[in-house]
């Protein structure tokens, strides 16, 4: 049975050119973390694997960075950054574990950060 | 142009061990990671287990964890791999196979090497 | 481990049919799917990835769709070098794993 929880850093907003840190934490369950995947659109940004670390996506290397922890850092922000991302924990033996993050990206300077909330 | 030479066929009795060997050329090797891939007579496939030729870190698939081992030589090109306390049923040929990404560990294997035949006989 | 499974395990066809290949996997692997071509004796040799790109060198009858958990590989008229057994594998989420095989067979 799946016990565990996911929280994350919710609905948040950063100013266009800035950078945000999007951030999961896994909790309530002693499941052991195999591989963390980050997607946004299906696709893959990076994965933190186990037993071969960090690992960010061609495709994504100059705009991403890893961390802190399991979270993970985009960088020179624009407005077509605005969407869904997704923190997949990758677990044994639960399974897989899915959090959601909202980022919308601003012109303006008034980027305000949403509050924690929890994804059963 | 990209070759992964492999070592040659090997016969062993139950309980040896055995060491594949395969040479890379023709781009950077520690740019791109590894993977062991074995297949059975008349069988399909089987992921055995990845290695960073750049720092040396490896993941090995569940069923190979203590018996496998990866391991890499930056000075002449070649990752190895060891396979310990062999069984009739590891009978096999193993292939070498790079990813295709860079420094991306989940790409696809795009170029393999010609694979080495492993028999476990007594 | 995401398991990957492969229909028919086998066929017969004729050179010139449209030959189509299925892999479904136990979850969402996104667009994370490589299919492969091996011939007896030879180490296989990367058709598709990520689901519809065609690898270099690979000819344009050889097309991949699908994303989520179902995934599809047409040859669109077979010749007679297609004869040889194709493996779906997933690429998203490390161990990467592969399908049972489809053997394509002559008629």
């Known amino acids: 049975m799946m016990t565990g929880t996911i929280e994350t850093t919710g609905n948040i907003s950063a100013e266009k050119g800035g950078s945000i840190i999007l951030q999961c934490h896994l909790s309530s369950t002693t499941a052991q973390v195999t591989q963390v995947n980050w997607e946004q659109q299906d696709q893959l940004l990076a994965i933190c694997n186990a037993d071969l670390g960090w690992h960010i996506s061609p495709s994504f290397k100059d705009r991403v960075a890893p961390g802190p922890g399991l979270g993970l850092t985009l960088q020179s922000l624009t407005v077509n950054d605005t969407g869904e991302y997704f923190c997949i924990y990758h677990t044994y033996p639960d399974g897989t574990y899915t959090g959601r993050i909202f980022l919308e990206v601003l012109e303006s300077s008034v980027a305000e950060h949403g509050a924690r909330f929890q994804i059963p | 142009q990209v070759q992964l030479v492999q070592s040659g066929a090997e016969v062993k009795k139950p309980g040896a061990s055995v060491k594949v060997s395969c040479k890379a050329s023709?781009?950077?090797?520690?740019?791109?990671?590894m993977h062991w891939v074995r297949q059975a007579p008349g069988q399909g496939l089987e992921w055995m287990g990845i290695?960073?030729?750049?720092?040396?870190?490896?993941s090995y698939a569940q069923m190979f964890q203590g018996r496998v081992t990866m391991t890499r030589d930056t000075s002449t090109s070649t990752v190895y791999m060891e396979l310990s306390s062999l069984r009739s049923e590891d009978t096999a040929v193993y292939y070498c196979?790079?990813?295709?990404?860079?420094?991306?560990?989940?790409?696809?294997?795009?170029?393999w090497g010609q694979g080495t035949l492993v028999t476990v006989s007594s | 481990d995401i398991q990957m499974t492969q229909s028919p395990s086998s066929l017969s066809a004729s050179v010139g049919d449209r030959v189509t290949i299925t892999c479904r996997a136990s979850?969402?692997?996104?667009?994370?799917l490589n299919w492969y071509q091996q011939k007896p004796g030879k180490a296989p040799k990367l058709l598709i990835y990520?689901?519809?790109n065609l690898q270099s060198g690979v000819p344009s009858r050889f097309s991949g769709s699908g994303s989520g958990t179902d995934f599809t590989l047409t040859i669109s008229s077979l010749q007679p070098e297609d004869f040889a057994t194709y493996y779906c594998?997933?690429?998203?989420?490390?161990?990467?794993?592969f399908g049972q095989g489809t053997k394509v067979e002559i008629r």
């Open positions: 290695i960073n030729p750049s720092g040396g870190r490896t």
């Open positions: 594998q997933q690429s998203y989420i490390i161990p990467p794993t």
């Open positions: 023709g781009y950077t090797f520690t740019s791109y990671y």
């Open positions: 979850q969402s692997i996104r667009r994370y």
């Open positions: 990520s689901a519809s």
């Open positions: 196979a790079r990813d295709r990404e860079e420094q991306w560990p989940v790409g696809g294997f795009d170029y």
